[in-house]
């Protein structure tokens, strides 16, 4: 048998060790200990006993079928125990009556059915974070479970397997900053939700069948919800229960943020809020995030006019990854106070493109996203956006374009242009002189010889050049990335011609550690302050001598030097 | 109607591997939340994993988290089952299960295939 492996500060490993109980010589020096991914079975009431100073145990996955009841009795400095993912089908609250200072509990993924016969937490008086249930038997949530805790920054409760909850339950705990829920269906949701009305800021709903979801008033006095945001993670919606949900709304008055993660609509956007009652209530709302939205009948999919007076007043918009390939005019025209867009990774071309950035789409639109989408002409794509007079950043990057032309159009108060990603060779007069940041990483350019007044910051890693651009090109840049090139040198005249530079950040270049260059870093220690990366990405690729050395280590050969 | 079919059991050494695969007939497999159960000689049938419809969740029994692995491939509508470092208790006939909700319930699961059969020898 393995032993544990401990650092001067007292954190001991004892990972992956195949213990079959827990080992002996633990002391009082020991601060943290980890005894996951064995095979314990069984923690005694003295095994622990030596440990009266440990402030983190963690015993995830290691087969524990039974603690004593005083096996922690003398952890009262413990701050963080981790017992998931074992095999207790019961839980004992003499285990956690000596754990005073106790932040972190997670007893999630083991085969409870309730949380024990009497309430587990009432000495817990620290506790920040709690994760309780698992996937296949935790069945029920009662309202002695909870008694005890008034604050949590962390609630995670995975009762994919609930069949009874009791009004109330989670009522007690008056203040949760994070409530993570995962449910398999929605039957017990209104109930829940009419408890944490009035204590979750942030509520997180996980891979909850919502198909059958059926909206009725909550037996709630007027409320004021701290709820700001509201998340579906892998939940399943049809046209009918998203109308449903809706009307949760005029409960949440605060809520600012609503993010869709992974879900499927069984549907075709036929949504009809307006007999939900809900327009004037989503005034707050200011941001919708919708990331990997699955709609199996995409290609039937509705022109959403029925949401238009929802969206008037959102400010930020993400729709990633999930199939768009067109935003309707109307409907841009519609999004009178949306500042940021983002489409990446989506299906949209040029033509489609220009229907939705039509006259009078999205006037207040400042940044505009459109990564990894199908467009191919930047100068078609610039025309297109010229209709967006306010923005100022645009994202193209991971889009194939075609060779870029000498002459195009932007908006006018475009200050920020990525082409990361875009197999671009060459960089001509296509972009716009009024760029202030530019970021053509990651791309086939072997040089970059284009006047850029106004440019601040440039990012050009992953490319070919050989070496810095000339400095006269941007006259007051602050910012310079420069990974990942092949470049081979740099000198004191170079950095020194850019009068404003801030930061370079030029590692992982191809460097000749020539005489000139090592004794130019030796003379300037003042390079660290410049150089962001600088010692550990800079290693010398030639002379073979000196191959894999860092420029910082490197000396030169006293013979080669002074011939 | 979705029918599954199971394929790769068989007799292993403890400490060996196996791939379980579930092939799904029909074209709405992506709409379904896939698990594996087990049912070892005179037990009940038991919670092994599921994954949602898109791959993005997964979940395990205790008893199987760290050795056991869960994907599904929706353009070929298979479900697979990896499974390492096998011992003589994971012996069972494994079945493949579709349904609507994501939960460790066997009797919220609508389709099931026929099982598996799995023998780990010490």
């Known amino acids: 048998q393995e032993s544990l492996s401990c650092d001067a500060s007292g954190v001991c490993d004892g990972r992956s060790r195949s213990f079959t109980s827990i080992p002996s010589g633990l002391t009082a020096a020991m601060k943290s200990l980890d005894l996951s991914f064995n095979k314990i079975t069984y923690i005694g009431h003295g095994d622990l006993r030596a440990c009266a100073n440990l402030q983190v145990l963690i015993l995830k996955s290691s087969r524990i079928n039974t603690i004593e009841g005083d096996a922690f009795y003398s952890l009262g400095s413990l701050e963080h125990l981790d017992l998931s993912d074992n095999h207790l089908s019961s839980l004992s609250s003499s285990w956690f009556g000596p754990l005073s200072s106790l932040k972190y509990l997670n007893l999630m993924g083991n085969p409870y059915q309730t949380l024990g016969v009497t309430s587990l937490f009432p000495n817990l008086t620290n506790l920040q974070t709690l994760r309780i249930g698992n996937v296949e038997t935790f069945s029920e949530i009662r309202r002695i479970d909870f008694a005890g805790l008034t604050s949590l920054n962390e609630l995670e409760i995975k009762a994919l397997s609930l069949r009874n909850y009791q009004s109330q339950s989670l009522k007690s705990i008056r203040d949760i900053h994070h409530l993570t829920l995962h449910l398999s269906e929605s039957a017990f949701l209104l109930e829940i939700f009419a408890d944490i009305l009035s204590s979750v800021r942030y509520l997180e709903l996980r891979d909850t069948n919502l198909a059958r979801f059926q909206f009725s008033p909550l037996p709630v006095d007027e409320v004021s919800s701290p709820m700001k945001k509201l998340a579906f993670r892998g939940s399943v919606l049809t046209d009918e229960s998203f109308n449903e949900l809706l009307k949760l709304l005029r409960y949440i008055l605060e809520l600012s943020e609503v993010e869709f993660d992974d879900c499927t609509l069984n549907g075709l956007g036929d949504f009809n809020p307006s007999e939900s009652d809900v327009v004037s209530e989503l005034g707050k709302v200011e941001t919708v995030t919708i990331r990997r939205l699955h709609i199996p009948q995409f290609y039937l999919f509705y022109d959403l006019s029925t949401v238009y007076s929802l969206l008037e007043k959102v400010k930020r918009i993400t729709v990633e990854n999930s199939k768009v390939f067109l935003v309707p005019c109307s409907f841009s025209q519609h999004l009178k106070s949306l500042e940021f867009l983002d489409l990446s990774e989506n299906l949209m071309v040029e033509e489609y493109l220009k229907n939705s950035a039509c006259k009078g789409a999205w006037p207040s639109l400042q940044t505009l996203v459109l990564s990894q989408n199908h467009l191919r002409s930047m100068q078609k794509t610039g025309e297109i956006l010229l209709t967006l007079k306010n923005l100022t950043s645009l994202d193209i990057s991971r889009n194939t374009f075609h060779p870029m032309p000498d002459s195009c159009q932007w908006p006018e108060k475009m200050r920020f242009l990525n082409l990361s990603s875009t197999g671009i060779r060459v960089v001509k007069t296509c972009i716009p002189q009024t760029l202030e940041v530019l970021d053509v990483s990651n791309n086939n350019l072997d040089s970059f010889s284009l006047f850029l007044p106004r440019l601040q910051e440039l990012y050009i890693s992953r490319n070919k050049l050989k070496t810095l651009p000339d400095a006269s090109l941007f006259p007051v840049l602050l910012v310079m990335k420069i990974r990942e090139n092949a470049v081979s040198t740099f000198s004191k005249d170079q950095l020194g011609s850019f009068p404003k530079l801030e930061t370079l950040e030029a590692g992982d270049n191809h460097f000749v550690c020539s005489c000139e260059l090592l004794s130019f870093t030796m003379e300037t220690p003042a390079l660290a302050q410049i150089l962001v990366d600088w010692p550990d990405s800079y290693l010398c690729d030639s002379p073979p001598r000196l191959h894999g050395h860092r420029l910082q280590d490197a000396r030169p050969s006293v013979l080669e030097c002074h011939q | 109607e979705v029918q599954l079919v199971e394929s790769g059991g068989g007799l292993v050494q403890a400490g060996g591997s196996l791939r379980l695969s579930c092939a799904a007939s029909g074209r709405t497999f992506s709409s379904y939340v896939m698990g594996w159960f087990r049912q070892a000689p005179g037990k009940e049938r038991e919670f092994v994993s599921v994954?949602?419809?898109?791959?993005?969740?997964?979940d395990y029994a205790s008893s199987v988290k760290g050795r056991f692995t869960i994907s599904r491939d929706n353009a070929k509508n298979t479900v697979y089952l990896e499974m390492t470092s096998l011992e003589p208790e994971d012996t069972a006939v494994y079945y493949c299960a579709a349904g609507e909700y994501y939960t460790g319930i066997s009797s919220r699961y609508d389709y099931w295939g026929q099982g598996t059969p799995v023998t780990v020898s010490s």
């Open positions: 994954i949602n419809r898109s791959g993005g969740s997964t």
